[in-house]
């Protein structure tokens, strides 16, 4: 049929609660595209209707929630203009928890479930949800060995849970928990996280490598929308945050009230050496005071800008 | 590495009880689940269940919920099963097992204690 | 629950003999929680194979496990003295966790 297939790694996921996937590969999926869910080569498509259990929603597949029997290997095609991209992805599902039972548990533990915290520094842990915009996500509650964390050491800041002052105890078996909305329905998400303690203040050199943007002016028309990605790649045992900045200052909080430039939500395609980070950023309406403005993609160490630039004037129009 | 200390034996009267304990070395003993196994004489070996520390949770085989209570001390690292109502059947070695995050299966074992159930 | 049945219950080898014992499952279980254990007269078990195929610790290459959905199986390459027990199969995907009723292996 024509279409190049793209192999990716394991998901191992939870059953009894939402998962979703979101088929983006860039460049592919930047720009006019059409994407169509498959599950184990069915040449019936994923359905699209939103009370469906399991559902495409955008060029997303939604389960709600994730059943044992969903364990397999699903396609996403893309299809631009001139191009067909087959994504693979195997998704497996185990049934229990661990703090309800060991039973049934984590058959094996992905890259996904660990996360580094350094001795001694402030350090943090993010919670991966990863949900298309039709799902809204409550607070965050995080837990670690079953218990849900206290103490002033410990803020939860969005999808982070801030640790102070890292110490030797704080290794262990953390969980973050939402409750996540969809059409009415209330679903609970609850991921686990390994997390170890490192001495070592990076990982053995490796800098997290934004590939887009790279220090550059981008010509935008006053008035319109623009969307611009971040792509990062990035060891897969990082604890790296990735966001947009303004004047030092995350976007978000910069325009906090009119909400008119925003941060994306954070998505990842894993590869087998690393994975591949997208997060973006809206300009909902440009303004003439986004000209000029270093807008920083943040990695890290690692940091890229674009600058909006009024495109030249085109002569040929008079 | 894990070092589980068990009673080499008990000796009790039929219709007595017993609690059995299970001694954790490291400091890993609240985050695993300990497991407690039977095996009677020159016979196979059969689950009991499972109890989580931290938080006190249990599983129990549906055979033993009337028979075994699993119990933990967190601050000496030991975890116990009451036997209650003992009869010769409940003669047997009786091992516990901790699971890991991760690793569910056995990968280490007590010794086990040997309970003889005997006027 | 799930009722693992092993077979042969016992058998004798010679040294130098390839072994293999089965372990049929009532139902289908993922091999991330079918695991074998050996055990010798008045010692505890020892985990042998972890999910199906994978060798513990301290384990000798002669052995090896494979299988999936209902069948699995263990083979031991090259009998050695050392390897008469008994070999129990074990699963630990639903609750409650059971064990094959046992191979007890003899020497021939």
């Known amino acids: 049929d024509g279409c190049k297939d793209i192999f990716m790694k394991n998901e191992i996921l939870s059953a009894s609660q939402p998962f979703a996937f979101n088929c983006t590969f860039p460049p592919i999926t930047s720009g006019e595209v059409s994407v169509t869910w498959y599950k184990n080569s069915s040449k019936i498509p994923v359905s699209k209707i939103i009370q469906s259990r399991i559902h495409q929603d955008e060029t997303w597949i939604l389960f709600l929630p994730m059943e044992w029997g969903d364990s397999g290997v699903y396609q996403c095609v893309i299809k631009g203009r001139d191009s067909c991209h087959r994504i693979h992805v195997n998704l497996t599902v185990f049934e229990k928890h661990w703090c309800d039972t060991s039973i049934g548990g984590l058959p094996n533990l992905s890259d996904e479930y660990k996360q580094i915290l350094h001795l001694g520094k402030d350090d943090s842990l993010t919670c991966h949800l990863h949900f298309p915009k039709s799902c809204v996500l409550g607070p965050i509650k995080w837990y670690k060995d079953c218990n849900e964390i206290k103490g002033e050491r410990f803020t939860v800041l969005e999808t982070r849970l801030l640790v102070s002052n890292v110490s030797a105890e704080d290794r262990g078996n953390y969980a973050c928990q939402a409750i996540l909305t969809h059409s009415g329905k209330q679903y609970e998400v609850l991921n686990g996280i390994t997390v170890s303690i490192t001495e070592r203040a990076g990982y053995g050199g490796s800098v997290p490598k934004i590939i887009y943007p790279k220090n550059h002016s981008i010509e935008v028309q006053l008035g319109t929308t623009l969307i611009v990605d971040c792509n990062v790649t990035d060891t897969k045992d990082n604890t790296n945050l990735r966001c947009w900045r303004v004047n030092n200052t995350l976007v978000d909080d910069y325009y906090d009230e009119s909400k008119r430039i925003r941060e994306g939500v954070e998505t990842h395609v894993s590869f087998r050496e690393h994975n591949l980070y997208t997060v973006n950023i809206t300009f909902l309406e440009v303004k003439m005071e986004d000209y000029g403005l270093p807008f920083m993609c943040h990695a890290g160490v690692s940091t890229a800008y674009i600058i909006l630039q009024l495109p030249a004037p085109d002569f040929r129009a008079y | 590495q894990v070092q589980l200390q068990q009673p080499g034996a008990e000796l009790v009267k039929p219709g007595a009880s017993v609690k059995l304990s299970c001694k954790a070395s490291?400091?890993?003993?609240?985050?695993?689940?300990m497991h407690w196994v039977k095996q009677r004489p020159g016979q196979g070996l059969e689950w009991i269940g499972e109890?989580?520390?931290?938080?006190?949770?249990?599983n129990y085989n549906e055979n033993f919920k009337s028979k075994a209570t699993l119990t933990v001390d967190k601050s000496s690292s030991a975890a116990y099963m009451q036997l209650s109502s003992l009869t010769s059947e409940d003669s047997a070695v009786y091992y516990c097992?901790?699971?890991?995050?991760?690793?569910?299966?056995?990968?280490?074992w007590g010794q086990g204690t040997l309970v003889t159930v005997s006027d | 629950e799930i009722v693992l049945t092993q077979s042969p219950t016992t058998m004798a080898a010679s040294p130098g003999e390839k072994i293999t014992i089965t372990c049929s499952a009532s139902?289908?279980?993922?091999?991330?929680?079918l695991h074998w254990y050996q055990q010798k007269p008045g010692f505890s078990p020892k985990l042998l194979i972890y999910?199906?195929?994978n060798l513990a610790s301290g384990v000798p290459a002669r052995f090896s496990g494979s299988g999936s959905g209902t069948s699995y199986s263990l083979t031991i390459g090259t009998m050695e003295a050392e390897d008469v027990a008994t070999y129990y199969c074990?699963?630990?995907?639903?609750?409650?966790?059971?064990f094959g009723a046992g191979t007890n292996l003899e020497l021939k």
């Open positions: 097992a901790p699971v890991f995050y991760g690793a569910p299966w056995f990968a280490y």
């Open positions: 999910r199906t195929s």
């Open positions: 139902s289908s279980i993922s091999s991330n929680y």
């Open positions: 109890i989580f520390p931290n938080s006190g949770r249990t």
């Open positions: 490291g400091d890993t003993f609240t985050n695993q689940w």
């Open positions: 074990q699963q630990g995907s639903s609750i409650p966790v059971t």
